[in-house]
Amino acid sequence: ALDTNYCFRNLEENCCVRPLYIDFRQDLGWKWVHEPKGYYANFCSGPCPYLRSADTTHSTVLGLYNTLNPEASASPCCVPQDLEPLTILYYVGRTPKVEQLSNMVVKSCKCS
Amino acid sequence: ALDTNYCFRNLEENCCVRPLYIDFRQDLGWKWVHEPKGYYANFCSGPCPYLRSADTTHSTVLGLYNTLNPEASASPCCVPQDLEPLTILYYVGRTPKVEQLSNMVVKSCKCS
């Protein structure tokens, strides 16, 4: 699986999850998020050669098409597969609010 | 929606579904598919600016991050959203077989 366990431990050029730390205030301008100050959102990148963690029959077909037609612009793209939520703390006036934001952290990638 | 109805009728630079005809024999080397000879598989391409058909909270965050940090290599990617099956005819010996291959035709795209 192209997950953090594998990708963070290997120098993988092809599609894999990569570490990306996002600071809410600095990187997004979100001053309203009180905690955490930032988090590892991660992202997916790297080429998708034929059959690499293909998401659908279409991505398999497109991967093969791209292999046999390397000049073609059509190829699968490395995108998030498994995502996890992030719990944040913010304030409404002086009242603290805790909320779970879904699909905030990429744990694994696929070729789609 | 970034679907064929919209994308095929507009000159859209950003993420959209693009027409791609694949000839089974010529493009994939699949001589075993008797009918059809080829089909419109289509593909997704184009930049994913902030908020464009964002698939998850992560893609929204990543889009905003990329807008505010344009030098960053992390950005959402334009990939298939809705796919449709394709019915094919092939032979096992002299016996014709009809099979529906799932997720073969891209009908719309998203930024993931």
Epitope: R25, E35, P36 | -
Partner: antibody
């Protein structure tokens, strides 16, 4: 590499004020919160407050409001903590520490403050 | 304010032993917790962040675990350089209070 260099030891009289500095290098000073921590001799750690040098935003421990004032100078990448109306209870080692990824990952060497007449 | 209750306050152990220090938060801190080691006269050093992640350069004999309100730091096969004081600290809303500390001494 990240470094936080604090000003030297201070000996001050009760009732006076003192300003401790923390010069940062090796990272983007403006865009990381700076925390300040107090440690009395032989005691544990107490969080005083934090400042975001980019816009001067601050958060204080209620216990230190009116006692500590945090400021930052972006041009010199230096954070400051002013302590006022000093008493013997303020005698302690004070640390600055960079906030990163849900922790304080780099700490200054500490500044010893002695309040005595 | 969130209170952090750390135990034990002190611990006398031999080299090679395994120790576990615990920290209890007065409310859920959603794994926003760090562990530090401090030697006499020195600044604290980050060991673990986000409850379970080992900081750069920290030996693998250290490990953090826990969630919700209960957290622990485990040190396997204690080395002589591991003796000193240990503190937990939460990062779930200011003030970021510390635990009272655990003094680890050589038996």
């Amino acid at each position: 590499q990240v470094q936080l260099q604090q000003s030297g030891a201070e000996l001050v009289k009760p009732g006076a004020s003192v300003k401790i500095s923390c010069k940062a290098s090796g990272y983007a000073f403006s865009s990381s919160w700076m925390n300040w921590v107090k440690q009395r001799p032989g005691k544990g750690l107490e969080w005083i407050g934090q400042i975001y040098p980019g816009d001067g935003d601050t958060n204080y421990n209620g216990k230190f409001k009116g006692k500590a004032t945090l400021t930052a100078d972006k041009s010199s990448s230096t954070a400051y903590m002013q302590l006022s109306s000093l008493t013997s209870e303020d005698s302690a080692v004070y640390f600055c520490a960079r906030h990163y990824d849900g922790s304080t990952d780099y700490w200054g060497q500490g500044t010893t403050l002695t309040v005595s007449s | 304010d969130i209170q952090m209750t750390q135990s034990p306050a002190s611990l006398s152990v031999s080299v090679g032993e395994t120790v576990t220090i615990t920290c209890r938060a007065s409310e859920n801190i959603y794994s926003n917790l760090a562990w530090y080691q401090q030697k006499q006269g020195k600044s604290p050093q980050l060991l673990v962040y986000a409850a379970t992640n080992l900081a750069d350069g920290v030996p693998s004999r250290f490990s953090g675990s826990g969630s919700g309100t209960q957290y622990s730091l485990k040190i396997n096969s204690l080395q002589s350089e591991d003796f000193g004081s240990y503190y937990c600290q939460h990062f779930w809303g200011t003030p970021y209070t510390f635990g009272g500390g655990t003094k680890l001494e050589i038996k």
